[in-house]
Amino acid sequence: SPTPFGPEGQLEDELHKPKAIQTEVKPSVRFNLRTSKDPEHEGCYLSLGHSQPLEDCGFNMTAKTFFIIHGWTMSGIFENWLHKLVSALHTREKDANVVVVDWLPLAHQLYTDAVNNTRVVGHSIARMLDWLQEKDDFSLENVHLIGYSLGAHVAGYAGNFVKGTVGRITGLDPAGPMFEGADIHKRLSPDDADFVDVLHTYTRSFGLSIGIQMPVGHIDIYPNGGDFQPGCGLNDVLGSMAYGTITEVVKCEHERAVHLFVDSLVNQDKPSFAFQCTDSNRFKKGICLSCRKNRCNSIGYNAKKMRNKRNSKMYLKTRAGMPFRVYHYQMKIHVFSYKNMGEIEPTFYVTLYGTNADSQTLPLEIVERIEQNATNTFLVYTEEDLGDLLKIQLTWEGASQSWYNLWKELRSYLSQPHNPGRELNIRRIRVKSGETQRKLTFCAEDPENTSISPGRELWFRKCRDGWRMKNETSPTVELP
């Protein structure tokens, strides 16, 4: 664990440590005002107490000011993501000041030492902000700190130490090791800014979680459950570079938070929406696609300020690359069984047909099991905007296409050897779009034929806007 009393050490240590000889020593924290999108352009270095560089470099006191804070580094140089983020901010907010906090000398250390340096770097940023506040027209309200990994906690310290309250902190996959379960003042927390939003892309329950698992903001967004990011599997990584390694997978998933944020800046017309949910499993079941009472929000730069009394965990699915947006649908399927079929695990697929496009064949992920004579809820998502849904094809996968399915079939047969006619009845499917919040009901195309069995399919056509059917008396329960 880090030394108690952190980077500054105890007072005796501070007094007894020999000071480095102060001859042309580069400061260990530098503030680089990026005046151009071009990563080759060096920009200007701001210096505490020196107003001239602010004037020379055209620092706009009334504009938004972004501070980009990198994390731990193995290379000791800026990584590519940082230049992309600088460029995206300049594109989106043309008049804004974009400041890169360069703490590379303190971050290019053993991880534990870099952690111990976060406090002092946060303090340096706070002192810079305190100095800027002395200038006319500069307002902390316009300050947005964006910290990646260890940099997210640096941003937390900066927000903690500054005199006043910064407008916003965005934590991009805040670092996990040595911060998980840490005291509220020793990590990024909702108290550090007026609005703290967080993207978690590399959290693991087992093994080392590079990103912090616990919520640390006003809203904490867990894309794809916050763990396995599409396009970051070993196969994907191996396919896209000559020597793919586990390290590259880690980097891909951890850094995905940055790219999701960049996406929100440059693809303003394709915002990704996240939905409040108590946990990832409930989200995977399709239970949490409501936008009532601030239960959904855009992710990244476009997130709406929400300062709930309690932290809000939010989830969404994404594509494997930019633009990351997908279209979420909740599907409620009431499954009737006229025969006692025992435990049954059908493998269902759906194809959605819309006015704009048709989806690919999408698996219905069964999180627990199919409940018979009950309504089952599923989450499906498409990469393209299908427009208004017209019809749905539901397929029960037939002949086993995997050892797992073969085992399921065998187990099902062993439990019910005298029940060859495995059959379920589905009369209608209710669908809710996460993005539009529209509810639709789809009825079996042939009301006389609502049964489905392995290798067979059923077609459903839109028969109603909304979920209430004419002959239904009980109101549908509004899901949380």
Epitope: F5, E12, K163, G164, A182, P190
Partner: antibody
Framework: QVQLQQSGAELMKPGASVKISCKAT????????IAWVKQRPGHGLEWIGE????????KYNKKFKGKATFTADTSSNTAYMQLSSLTSEDSAVYYC?????????WGQGTSVTVSS | DIVMTQSHKFMSTSVGDRVSITCKAS??????VAWYQQKPGQSPKLLIY???YRFTGVPDRFTGSGAGTEFTFTINSVQAEDLAVYYC?????????FGGGTKLEIK
């Protein structure tokens, strides 16, 4: 090493105010939160609130808002808590504690007795 | 506010025994829990932070575990000097809240 030295015991009349001090040595005073904790005889610990001396930021337990006021003097490395409109309910030992990993180090406590 | 509940106000044990004290949070506090020891007539001392990490200088017979809403503090081989009141505290959010305390008595 880190030390927090609190002011001595106080005997106060109901309705009066009292100001307790907590002098810190052994660390950088301005950048660590100092919390104040109440303990009534035979009772548990109750968090009153805390102050970050360098920025004078404060956090209060809503139960103690209007009762307790925190200040800090960075030139003397001393934190203060003032308790106003004292009643017998305020009779307790008050601790200051400095926060890093948790309440890492505590003062020895200041006993406040309110009696007419 | 998050309520921290220590169900046992008193626990009795013998020297050399292993004893466990439990603490329950009213909502998820993840692993943001600390344990303190207060000996008679003394100030509290930090023993465990972040649910399972021992603070500097704390003997390894003291351990902490748990996550979410249920936490346990264990003394593996109780010594006579461990007679004290033990408090849990959540440090996940403000206001910080303490459990009511568990007084450990040595038989």
């Amino acid at each position: 090493q880190v030390q927090l030295q609190q002011s001595g015991a106080e005997l106060m009349k109901p309705g009066a105010s009292v100001k307790i001090s907590c002098k810190a040595t052994g660390y950088t005073f301005s950048t660590y939160w100092i919390a104040w904790v109440k303990q009534r005889p035979g009772h548990g610990l109750e968090w009153i609130g805390e102050i970050l001396p360098g920025s004078a930021k404060t956090k209060y337990n809503k139960k103690f808002k209007g009762k307790a006021t925190f200040t800090a003097d960075t030139s003397s490395n001393t934190a203060y808590m003032q308790l106003s409109s004292l009643t017998s309910e305020d009779s307790a030992v008050y601790y200051c504690a400095v926060y890093d990993y948790g309440a890492d180090y505590w003062g020895q406590g200041t006993s406040v007795t309110v009696s007419s | 506010d998050i309520v921290m509940t220590q169900s046992h106000k008193f626990m009795s044990t013998s020297v050399g025994d292993r004893v466990s004290i439990t603490c329950k949070a009213s909502q998820d506090v993840y692993t943001a829990v600390a344990w303190y020891q207060q000996k008679p007539g003394q100030s509290p001392k930090l023993l465990i932070y972040s649910a399972s990490y021992r603070f500097t200088g704390v003997p390894d017979r003291f351990t902490g575990s748990g996550a979410g809403t249920e936490f346990t503090f264990t003394i593996n081989s109780v010594q006579a000097e461990d007679l004290a009141v033990y408090y849990c505290q959540q440090h996940y959010s403000i206001p910080r809240t303490f459990g009511g305390g568990t007084k450990l008595e040595i038989k």
